[in-house]
């Protein structure tokens, strides 16, 4: 057992049919040494006296809200959750596979620069009775500050039957160095509640690896006299980090017919324009990557090609 | 070229051949997303490799202050993985493919090692572990972590040059 | 006059390489997607490959060892043929595309590759 | 890659018929293919693309329809000058591919 956060610990059991459990000794927060009575939840059951309570904890409901009371007088609470081990691996039931980029990815990153800022995102079917808590730091063994804020419910989705919701927090690296060449990763740690079950989540990446830019910004089209062709101009994302000249980008241009079965045009370029051959409902899309290190391509930012 | 003094390097030839690193340093190892190497407890294998610091300098405004700093931290990191990927870690067993990019890419850093220091010049460089791994597949996985971090280092010194030919050219 | 000239052909060597032209007159070549096509000696039209802006497809038996590229301020088309074998022997024509390359508007007269030791 | 199955391979017809050939692809194409006519020694002529669209200056006769896998180009009315062999075209997003080829001959 440990202790979450004050007066809330967890209880960590192997969970496998006929399990022993696991021996708990509540004690309760107060001076007082004798007529201590404790209840769980909102039972008036007494479940022991003396001012402490030892438990046999083996299933949810041996979880839950201790209390102890002198006279009818509330003294103090301790909040079990369990977390389940299963073939000594520990539950992931909360949050659902992300499956990208690979299995068991339950949290997703992105940073849109190399300022030390980075958004990371999770998902579930759970609607109620569900917390989380965000911890990050950089480097394990001696970490170094990145500050978290309240994850919050970003988007609900419904996929056939269930409703999928979507959960994200910022983070900020307290002294970045966006020039320098990572060796630490930076470590992000989820704590997921849901009633009385409690689980961990953790993902370890590099700022470099999570870098996804913007799309190109202020897309242009201007037609080039007696020809079909196009010259396509296009300007770095606001988010991107400064200098240009340091933190440069390159782009990738496509000219896509209406349908997805029609060959695309692609032209790659580190520059900011580029020259296209246009043709009746086709549309123009430019997306940007990072220029020396092959992170995520950006979102397309597009226009008509008339 | 950075010779002693301090004069400034060729910044254009080495931006051009800082930029062929990471387009060889990414075909040489392209599937890095797929495979993270930090599970494998690598830290005894390649943590000892030089890193471009927070306070090397190879910053915009410490590149504009003093690029001789950054330059000799770029060139110690060149020679040490020149001298890896010259090592029996990428010429023993398993062989190479004949195409591997890994050739071209040990003497493009040979040639950008040059560029910033001539003969007769020699900046102190950083002495290389013995990395010695006896299994085929010991070796196979340390090649994919030098090349990881190959990338993340010549990422760093293409940003230097780019940078430094764009505003730091005479 | 709008027109398209195809140069190059001629006897080849198994094995042998060969590069053909195809020069565009009267209309600006870069505007357009081209493409190569050929016909065996009393067989059906061929697909070879195409080219866009700069984004090139081939036929699955042409990726390897022919290649399509284009040089606009010659306003010239070229298809570069390496490896040859017997099965090449063809006429091959370039072609515009109207919209992308299914739709060819505009072909060369054809230039005749022999493929022959 | 698709296929584009072209029937029939010969066809003898006489002046003022009523000519039909079908182009059939092994997956659905939409609206990409065209219709070419060629004459012996000569290069190929665009008569039909996006299936049913005349290209200018061929005469009405001609006509094309379908959408996706089945494909067909009509002659109204058989000329002297249509004695030639024609061949659909078809692409999707990474191939394009002829059909084997029509022979129209004189009955």
């Known amino acids: 057992i440990w202790e979450l956060k004050k007066d809330v610990y967890v209880v960590e059991l192997d969970w496998y049919p006929d399990a022993p459990g696991e021996m708990v000794v509540l004690t309760c927060d107060t001076p007082e040494e004798d007529g201590i009575t404790w209840t769980l939840d909102q039972s008036s059951e007494v479940l022991g006296s003396g001012k402490t309570l030892t438990i046999q904890v083996k299933e949810f409901g041996d979880a839950g809200q201790y209390t102890c009371h002198k006279g009818g007088e509330v003294l103090s609470h301790s909040l079990l959750l369990l977390h389940k081990k299963e073939d000594g691996i520990w539950s992931t039931d909360i949050l659902k596979d992300q499956k990208e980029p690979k299995n068991k990815t339950f949290l997703r990153c992105e940073a849109k620069n190399y300022s030390g800022r980075f958004t990371c995102w999770w998902l579930t079917t759970i609607s109620t009775d569900l917390t989380f808590s965000v911890k990050s730091s950089r480097g394990s063994s001696d970490p170094q500050g990145v500050t978290c804020g309240a994850a919050t419910l970003s988007a609900e989705r419904v996929r056939g039957d269930n409703k999928e919701y979507e959960y994200s927090v910022e983070c900020q690296e307290d002294s970045a160095c966006p020039a320098a060449e990572e060796s630490l990763p930076i470590e992000v740690m989820v704590d997921a509640v849901h009633k009385l079950k409690y689980e961990n989540y953790t993902s370890s990446f590099f700022i470099r690896d999570i870098i996804k830019p913007d799309p190109p910004k202020n897309l242009q089209l201007k037609p080039l006299k007696n020809s079909r062709q196009v010259e396509v101009s296009w300007e770095y994302p606001d988010t991107w980090s400064t200098p240009h000249s340091y933190f440069s980008l390159t782009f990738c241009v496509q000219v896509q017919g209406k349908s997805k079965r029609e060959k695309k045009d692609r032209v790659f370029t580190d520059k900011t324009s580029a020259t296209v051959i246009c043709r009746k409902n086709a549309s123009i899309s430019v997306r940007a990557q990072d220029r020396y290190y092959s992170s995520s391509w950006s979102e397309w930012a597009s226009v008509p090609c008339s | 070229r950075a010779v002693p003094g301090g004069s400034s390097p060729a910044w254009t030839q080495c931006q051009q051949l800082s930029q062929k690193l990471c387009t060889l340093a990414w075909s040489a190892h392209p599937l890095v997303g797929h495979m993270d190497l930090r599970e494998e407890g690598d830290e005894e294998t390649t943590n000892d490799v030089p890193h471009i610091q927070c306070g090397d300098g190879c910053d915009p405004q410490g590149l504009r202050d003093n690029s001789q700093f950054c330059l000799q931290r770029i060139h110690q990191g060149l020679i040490f993985y020149e001298k890896l990927l010259g090592s029996d870690i990428f010429t023993g067993e398993p062989s190479l493919l004949p195409d591997s990019p890994v050739g071209q890419l040990h003497a493009s850093l040979l040639g950008l090692s040059q560029l910033l220091q001539p003969e007769g010049h020699h900046w102190e460089t950083q002495q290389i572990p013995s990395l010695s791994p006896s299994q085929p597949w010991q070796r196979l996985l340390l090649r994919f972590k030098i090349l990881r971090s190959l990338q993340a280092f010549v990422a760093v010194a293409a940003r230097v040059f780019a940078h430094g030919a764009a505003t730091l050219s005479p | 006059e709008v027109q398209l000239v195809e140069s190059g052909g001629g006897l080849v060597q198994p094995g042998g390489s060969l590069r053909l032209s195809c020069t565009a007159s009267?209309?600006?070549?870069?505007?357009?997607?081209m493409t190569w096509v050929r016909q065996a000696p009393g067989k059906g039209l061929e697909w070879v490959g195409t080219?866009?802006?700069?984004?090139?497809y081939y036929a699955s038996w042409a990726k390897g060892r022919f290649t399509i590229s284009r040089d606009n301020s010659k306003n010239t088309l070229y298809l570069q043929m390496n490896s040859l074998r017997a099965e090449d022997t063809a006429v091959y024509y370039c072609?515009?595309?109207?919209?992308?390359?299914?739709?060819?508007?505009?072909w060369g007269q054809g230039t005749l590759v022999t493929v022959s030791s | 890659d698709i296929q584009l199955t072209q029937s029939p391979s010969f066809l003898s017809a006489s002046v003022g018929d009523r000519v039909t050939i079908t182009c059939q692809a092994s997956?659905?194409?939409?609206?990409?293919l065209a219709w070419y006519q060629q004459k012996p020694g000569k290069a190929p002529k665009l008569l039909i693309y996006?299936?049913?669209t005349l290209t200018s200056g061929v005469p009405s006769r001609f006509s094309g329809s379908g959408s996706g896998t089945e494909f067909t180009l009509t002659i109204s009315s058989l000329q002297p000058e249509d004695f030639a062999t024609y061949y659909c075209?078809?692409?999707?997003?990474?191939?394009?591919?002829f059909g084997g080829g029509t022979k129209v001959e004189i009955k």
């Open positions: 072609a515009r595309g109207l919209t992308t390359d299914y739709d060819l508007d505009l």
């Open positions: 009267g209309f600006s070549l870069s505007s357009y997607w």
């Open positions: 080219i866009a802006t700069s984004s090139t």
């Open positions: 997956e659905d194409i939409e609206s990409y």
């Open positions: 996006s299936a049913s």
């Open positions: 075209l078809g692409a999707d997003d990474t191939t394009t591919v």
